[in-house]
């Protein structure tokens, strides 16, 4: 018998230092590019190998980025969000939301799944 899939949502502050090739990740989302139904938030779609984000190790594909250097990412056009990152300076503080998939097995058993992407 299969259990239902639930998600454990956690928030984290991640401080990245811009590397020679930048921050090293891609994003999707925005009011004109909804990646998740009824959510115009900004999500990480790719972590580039050997980039600043990959070397730091905390930011994951599928994470939702809530703010950049304290600036809220709600209700932004996609390109405006991209520009915000590009103009964020050398030291960049990201407030991110991780969603961890938790598999609820049959009664009496609780197993943890892999992070969702």
């Amino acid at each position: 018998m299969n259990g239902r899939v639930d998600y454990l949502v956690t928030e984290e502050e991640i401080n990245l230092t811009r590397g020679p090739s930048g921050l090293g990740f891609n994003i999707v989302g925005g009011t004109d590019q909804q990646y998740v139904s009824n959510d115009s938030g900004i999500y990480v779609s790719r972590i580039k190998e050997n980039g600043a984000a990959a070397l730091d190790g905390r930011l994951q594909e599928g994470d939702k980025i809530l703010s950049v250097n304290g600036q809220d990412l709600k209700n932004l056009l996609h390109q405006d969000a991209v520009d915000l990152f590009r103009n964020a300076g050398y030291a960049v503080s990201l407030r991110v939301q991780h969603r961890l998939q938790v598999q609820n097995g049959p009664i009496g058993h609780r197993g943890e799944g892999d992070p969702s992407g």
């Epitope: 921050l23 779609s45 790719r46």
Partner: nanobody, 127 residues
């Protein structure tokens, strides 16, 4: 996992035209940045053209400017390369590339490292 399948290649005479298609899997195609590269025998992979997620920005190699046009149909999950005034030096395997989302760093459309999904390619021969 994104899958890219190219079609439309073939043998054409110099001065002729071809239209290549690249069909992509995935429900979020409208977030993909897409590009065409080509590789001739014994040569390095060469950037041809790129298009952003919405189709509002396009980029071309100098060697194809004014002759090739890249476009996309997000409803059909497909990107196109219209190739006119073909020359023998356009002979190559044409490969479609994609990445989900926009880089937060400087965008270098001609850099293969910008893309992490690649098709198998379609052969174009201009005689």
């Amino acid at each position: 996992e994104v899958q890219l399948v190219e079609s439309g290649g073939g043998l054409v005479q110099a001065g002729g035209s071809l239209r290549l298609s690249c069909a992509a899997s995935g429900r979020t195609f409208s977030t993909y940045e897409m590009a065409w590269f080509r590789q001739a025998p014994g040569k390095e992979r060469e950037f041809v053209a790129a298009i952003n997620w919405s189709g509002s920005s396009t980029y071309y190699a100098d060697s194809v400017k004014g002759r090739f046009t890249i476009s996309r149909d997000n409803a059909k999950n497909t990107v196109y390369l219209q190739m006119n005034s073909l020359k023998p030096e356009d002979t190559a395997v044409y490969v479609c590339a994609a990445v989900i989302g926009s880089t937060v760093d400087e965008y270098r459309p001609s850099d293969p490292l910008e893309y992490n999904y690649w098709g198998q390619g379609t052969q174009v021969t201009v005689s």
